[in-house]
């Protein structure tokens, strides 16, 4: 459920990787949703320390992204998904190994908390970028 | 349609305080910042600050801090700007802007003409 | 705070090219936007995120922004585009919004 609000990104966390002046929506299912979802994302991002350099910054692009979706113009804030061809690129072909890894301890309960799951996209159920170009965000 | 409607001129003393209105309408109000820029006469703009109608936030430019108060009414989809300790240098016409979903003020109102005179 | 800097005049003749700079410190980092004020009138926002057009703006007007000087270009300067142009940028590190000193453009 997209409830929620646009405004700049003012993060430390994704402001290299997000686009310049990012307008980013802020899920207000979070009591305070700026500092839920950079939190979310420092949470992720700390374990994404010990990846593979070729893994890293793929994984820190689609991260912050996902977490800290663009804003799509018009008068009900809406968020823009990451394209699926894009999500698809990071699990398949950057980050194969490290995917495989974060799946089977998902599947073991090897994670302490949630929070690491609402870091990581379903590729499968993004929009893909051939459907309506507009519909999503490529990193 | 997408429209920002502001309330009408106003004369005040020195000393006195002004209440702009802003009434949104043909969008998500709480989806979006509502920033007030101001513009003297003959002057350029000046931005005074901005309100998260969603949660009540406010960020005021260092101008006018301690002068400034914004707050937004969700309930009629309506921002307001007030002016405390008003000088003759705060004659201005006073705009209410907001960006629906990008980053620049892509909507603003028609404009609040407030004269300070004695 | 962030200062940007506009020539206050710029004339050109109509059918010509009409370019109005604004400098900034390092201005290419952050997004530029412009405004187009007439007289009487509320601005209009002619070019976002340092060359987007908004819907009905016509492509005659483009933007360009990089080092230290973001550029608003006109071409085919119609009588119509007599006007305050302004640029504008969000200061990252205040927080705050910041326009430029504006420049006026004159159609000979």
């Known amino acids: 459920d997209n409830k929620g609000y646009c405004a700049q990104y003012r993060g430390e966390v994704c402001n290299a990787v997000l686009a310049k002046d990012a307008l980013v929506f802020l899920n207000t299912s979070y009591a305070d949703p700026e500092e839920a979802q950079e939190l979310l994302v420092h949470t992720a991002w700390n374990e994404l320390k010990v990846v593979s350099p070729v893994c890293r910054p793929a994984a820190e692009a689609l991260l912050c992204n996902h977490i800290f979706q663009e804003c799509s113009p018009g008068v009900v804030p809406t968020p823009i998904p990451i394209c699926r061809e894009y999500c698809l690129a990071v699990k398949e072909l950057f980050c194969a190994k490290e995917w495989l890894v974060m799946e089977e301890k998902t599947h073991r309960g090897l994670y302490r908390s949630e929070m690491h799951l609402l870091s990581v996209p379903e590729c499968s159920k993004l929009p893909s970028m051939h459907w309506d170009p507009t519909a999503c965000a490529r990193l | 349609q997408v429209q920002l409607v502001q309330s009408g001129a106003e004369v005040k003393k020195p000393g006195a305080s002004v209440k702009v209105s802003c009434k949104a309408s043909?969008?998500?109000?709480?989806?979006?910042?509502m920033h007030w820029v101001r513009q003297a006469p003959g002057q350029g703009l000046e931005w005074m600050g901005w309100?998260?109608?969603?949660?009540?936030?406010?960020n005021y430019a260092q101008k006018f801090q301690g002068r400034v108060t914004m707050t937004r009414d969700t309930s009629i989809s309506t921002a307001y700007m007030e002016l405390t300790r008003l000088r003759s240098d705060d004659t201005a016409v006073y705009y209410c802007?907001?960006?629906?979903?990008?980053?620049?003020?892509?909507?603003w109102g028609q404009g609040t003409m407030v004269t300070v005179s004695s | 705070s962030y200062v940007l800097t506009q020539p206050p005049s710029v004339s050109v003749a109509p059918g010509q090219t009409a370019r109005i700079t604004c400098g900034g410190n390092?201005?290419?980092?952050?997004?530029v936007h412009w405004y187009q004020q007439k007289p009487g009138q509320a601005p209009v926002l002619v070019v976002y995120?340092?060359?987007d057009r908004p819907s009905g703006i016509p492509e005659r007007f483009s933007g360009s922004n990089s080092g230290n000087t973001a550029t608003l270009t006109i071409s085919r300067v119609e009588a119509g585009d007599e006007a305050d142009y302004y640029c504008?940028?969000?200061?990252?590190?205040?927080?705050?919004?910041?326009f430029g000193t504006g420049t006026k453009v004159t159609v000979l």
């Open positions: 309100i998260n109608p969603n949660s009540g936030g406010t």
């Open positions: 504008q940028v969000w200061d990252r590190s205040s927080d705050h919004y910041v």
């Open positions: 043909g969008y998500t109000f709480t989806g979006y910042y």
């Open positions: 390092n201005i290419g980092s952050k997004s």
């Open positions: 995120d340092d060359s």
């Open positions: 802007a907001s960006g629906l979903g990008i980053s620049a003020f892509d909507i």
